[in-house]
């Protein structure tokens, strides 16, 4: 065979990934690999992930002679050990006036009265703890409730008898019940006065309210 067909182990170099070829014999060679590679021709990227240092559930992503940590959303930093301040990242993390409190690996919301839930989006059902009298209907409000009374009942909790039931107001007067004590209040038409709107008044006087 001619000299042009002679095998020269390092020409061209069989070493890849930046490896350096060294001829060790007539037909043999050795590759000196760059850090991070191995194999007879430096063809293999060494896996740097075994027993990695990614913490808090971080996932190791192998590189060349190094690795990166892919962190869960609540962690950051080289090894996922730095807490993400969700309160800074999400100014509206807490709703309905709730205050955001950053914590290691997460955050919490301190809700204002009447709201609950992780992000203060749930209106607390005040009716669950309300003491509306049986037979009345509870209406939930924000940090409060109101009782809708059946006929014949009055008061904030519908615990009083409605004094207007007996029609104590005369002469077309309007009867209202005082929600605190259950007593009636007569709003007299023009020309009448008195607790029951039974007394005449001088002309010129307009409506009169009388409590009883």
């Amino acid at each position: 065979a001619g000299s042009d067909s002679l095998y020269v182990p390092c020409a061209p170099s069989p070493c890849v990934n930046g490896g350096t070829c060294r001829q060790t014999g007539d037909f043999t060679f050795e590759c000196n690999c760059l850090p991070g590679f191995e194999g007879s021709t430096c063809e293999r990227n060494i896996d740097d992930c075994p027993n990695h240092r990614c913490q808090n559930g971080g996932v190791c992503v192998d590189g060349v002679n190094t690795y990166n940590c892919r962190c869960p959303p609540q962690w950051t930093g080289q090894f996922c050990t730095e807490d993400v301040d969700e309160c800074l990242l999400q100014p509206n993390a807490c709703q309905n006036g709730g205050t955001c409190a950053n914590r290691n690996g997460g955050y919490g919301c301190v809700c204002v009265n009447g709201w609950s839930g992780d992000d203060c989006s749930e209106n607390i059902d005040d009716c669950a703890f309300a003491s509306c009298t049986p037979g009345s209907t509870c209406i939930d409000r924000v940090a409060s409730f109101s009782c809708m009374c059946p006929e014949g009942k009055a008061g904030l909790l519908c615990h009083l008898d409605d004094a207007c039931i007996s029609n104590p107001c005369h002469k077309g007067a309007l009867c209202d019940t005082n929600p605190l004590n259950g007593q009636y209040i007569c709003t007299c038409p023009q020309g009448y006065k008195g607790a029951d709107c039974t007394e005449d008044v001088d002309e010129g006087n307009s409506h009169h309210h009388h409590h009883h």
Epitope: G57, G63, Q78, G105
Partner: antibody
């Protein structure tokens, strides 16, 4: 509050065995690796190795490989550094540490190991 | 391993004056993720090292603002803008970009 509490000082003779401890509290122990750092008298700190409490996997500085072992007891949230045969050159202050904002953010108070005949 | 060289070995500064400590690495500390993992620690006698600055220039919680860090690549600096009596200690730089993490030899800061 993150706390790492180490066992007390030890005086040993060459060839003796030793196991020192580091108890972690105030955080989720299994979420963080525990490092051991050696500081020889008058010298700077040297990272020795770490253990992953969740798996028990370890990683060592090549310089310290085969000289000591690191283990963990998850139930008591405690990591250990152990020698089977101490040498005079093992005399040093040994710290355990945990990562945080940077490397080795939280440290134990240290365990002084003196090896002398 | 990456060699961390600190200078000077010791430093005497008057109270209220500026103290500057340098740290040089044997190779670039820029990680493949783009960050530079160079940290500074303070160690007082009989105590463990205490993290002051992480990732070149971020002060750790509770660290006074007279401590600041700067630099890039292979050259880094810790500055104490106005030295206080409680700052007397040995200061170490640490790199965690390359395995294994390596500390500098330390710089002792004293009062002149």
């Amino acid at each position: 509050e993150v706390q790492l509490v180490q066992s007390g000082a030890e005086v040993k003779k060459p060839g003796e065995s030793l196991k020192i401890s580091c108890k972690g509290s105030g955080y989720t122990f299994s979420n963080y690796v525990i490092h051991w750092v050696r500081q020889m008298p008058g010298k700077g700190p040297e990272w020795t190795g770490y253990i992953i409490p969740g798996s028990g996997g370890t990683k060592f500085n090549e310089k310290f490989k085969g000289q000591a072992t690191i283990s963990v007891d998850k139930s008591s949230t405690t990591a250990y550094l152990q020698w089977s045969s101490l040498k005079a050159s093992d005399t040093a202050m040994y710290y355990c540490a945990r990562d945080g904002a940077g490397s080795f953010t939280y440290w134990g108070q240290g365990t002084l190991v003196t090896v002398s005949s | 391993d990456v060699v961390m060289t600190q200078s000077p070995d010791s430093l005497a500064v008057s109270l209220g004056e500026r103290a500057t400590i340098n740290c040089r690495s044997s190779q670039s500390l820029v990680h493949s993720d783009g960050n530079t993992y160079l940290h500074w620690f303070q160690q007082k006698p009989g105590q463990p090292p205490k993290l002051l600055i992480y990732r070149i220039s971020n002060r750790f919680s509770g660290v006074p603002d007279r401590f600041s860090g700067s630099g890039s690549g292979t050259d880094f600096t810790l500055t104490i803008s106005s030295l206080q009596a409680e700052d007397v200690a040995v200061y170490y730089c640490l790199q965690s970009t390359h395995f294994p993490d390596t500390f500098g030899g330390g710089t002792k800061v004293e009062i002149k």
